[in-house]
């Protein structure tokens, strides 16, 4: 299998975990945390970033403690330096984790789902338009 | 070939302690989390442990939590279940398995246990 | 914790037959959290479908898994003698399997 589709798969991957999650929004810590939403064009690694660093938590209630704790942890897998560097290449434009809108764990997760479906759609796209840069 | 070879079965009196290898061979051990199962006679499956591929998190089914310990040796691509305080219901033929997500982002990643070792009978009787 | 319960417990089927198997959960469960094992006496499980329904490397195509939120089914198409085992739901995350169904020859 290309390393693309291993890609895409592992992106469709993230999208179920945070769908695991929010079956499980009650058993989380009600913090609020930063949830880039609208996120501009070339700064969707950066907001994938900030979300990845998001201090998600289980509330230890006992019950759903061990899925969500694998869960929130494969969601922080770190993809490939190859992606890291297009992150980097947009860095300094992006706008820093603190300034995205602080959400509840429920919205959280569903702004993280969208923009993942929207960085799934970019790369399709690129890739039918024959982009390298996906 | 990709394999998981368990070891360290046997009899012992309740109360006793026991320490379960799995040796991994044919694929990069270091890359994937890790699974210790059994089945008592005539039972069902029961997921007894796992850890992560780095050693980072483990997990333990109530059951035995408390009294068994789940550790790896990447460096000799072995896994270990050190098993304190046995009991009778204890009694089981334990498995190892490869958890199926690999670290690796283009890795395996499938949401299972994807390789099984055959199995190591314990026996906990007085 | 979630609890998974399979149906029937015991299927008496023929070679050639259809076999449909259930498992339900006490709870929502994401597709991709919903594997199926085969074990056969005296050897260890063996990893059929994740993901609710892709087939694992090396697995027929006559077994297929479906199902979506709490009801997740699994199909042999066309029993063949090899089939006839013990089948576990599993859900990834908490590892938790159900007590299995048993297919057996009629």
């Known amino acids: 299998m290309q390393g693309q589709d291993r890609h895409m798969i592992r992106m469709r991957q993230l999208i179920d975990i945070v769908d695991q999650l929010k079956n499980y929004v009650n058993d989380l810590v009600p913090e609020f945390l930063p949830a880039p939403e609208d996120v501009e064009t070339n700064c969707e690694w950066s907001a994938f970033s900030c979300f990845q660093k998001a201090q998600l938590k289980s509330a230890n209630t006992g019950n759903n403690e061990r899925i969500i704790n694998v869960s929130i942890k494969k969601l922080k897998r770190k993809p490939p330096s190859t992606n890291a560097g297009r992150r980097q290449k947009h860095r300094l434009t992006c706008p820093s984790c603190d300034s995205y809108e602080k959400k509840p764990p429920k919205e959280f997760l569903e702004r993280f789902k969208s923009l993942l479906q929207k960085m799934i759609h970019q790369h399709l796209s690129s890739r039918t338009h024959g982009s390298e840069d996906s | 070939q990709v394999q998981l070879v368990e070891s360290g079965g046997g009899v012992v009196q309740p109360g006793r302690s026991l320490r379960l290898s799995c040796a991994a061979s044919?694929?990069?051990?270091?890359?994937?989390?890790m699974h210790w199962v059994r089945q008592a006679p005539g039972k069902g499956l029961e997921w007894v442990a796992f850890i992560w591929y780095d050693g980072s998190d483990k997990y333990y089914a109530d059951s035995v939590k408390g009294r068994f310990t789940i550790s790896r040796d990447n460096s000799k691509n072995t896994l270990y279940l050190q098993m304190n305080s046995l009991r009778a219901e204890d009694t089981a033929v334990y498995y190892c398995?490869?958890?199926?997500?690999?670290?690796?982002?283009?890795?395996?990643?499938?949401?299972?246990?994807?390789?099984w070792g055959q199995g190591t009978t314990v026996t906990v009787s007085s | 914790e979630i609890v998974l319960t399979q149906s029937p417990g015991t299927l008496s089927l023929s070679p050639g037959e259809r076999a449909t198997l259930s498992c339900r959960a006490s709870?929502?469960?994401?597709?991709?959290?919903l594997a199926w094992y085969q074990q056969k006496p005296g050897q260890a499980p063996r990893l059929l479908i994740y993901g609710a329904s892709a087939r694992a490397t090396g697995i027929p195509d006559r077994f297929s898994g479906s199902g979506s939120g709490t009801d997740f089914t699994l199909t042999i198409s066309r029993l063949e003698p090899e089939d006839f085992a013990v089948y576990y739901c599993?859900?990834?995350?908490?590892?938790?399997f159900g007590q299995g169904t048993k297919v057996e020859i009629k």
């Open positions: 599993q859900q990834y995350g908490s590892w938790t």
């Open positions: 709870q929502s469960v994401s597709s991709s959290y």
């Open positions: 044919g694929f990069t051990f270091s890359s994937y989390g």
């Open positions: 398995a490869r958890d199926g997500d690999s670290s690796d982002w283009y890795g395996d990643y499938y949401f299972g246990m994807d390789v």
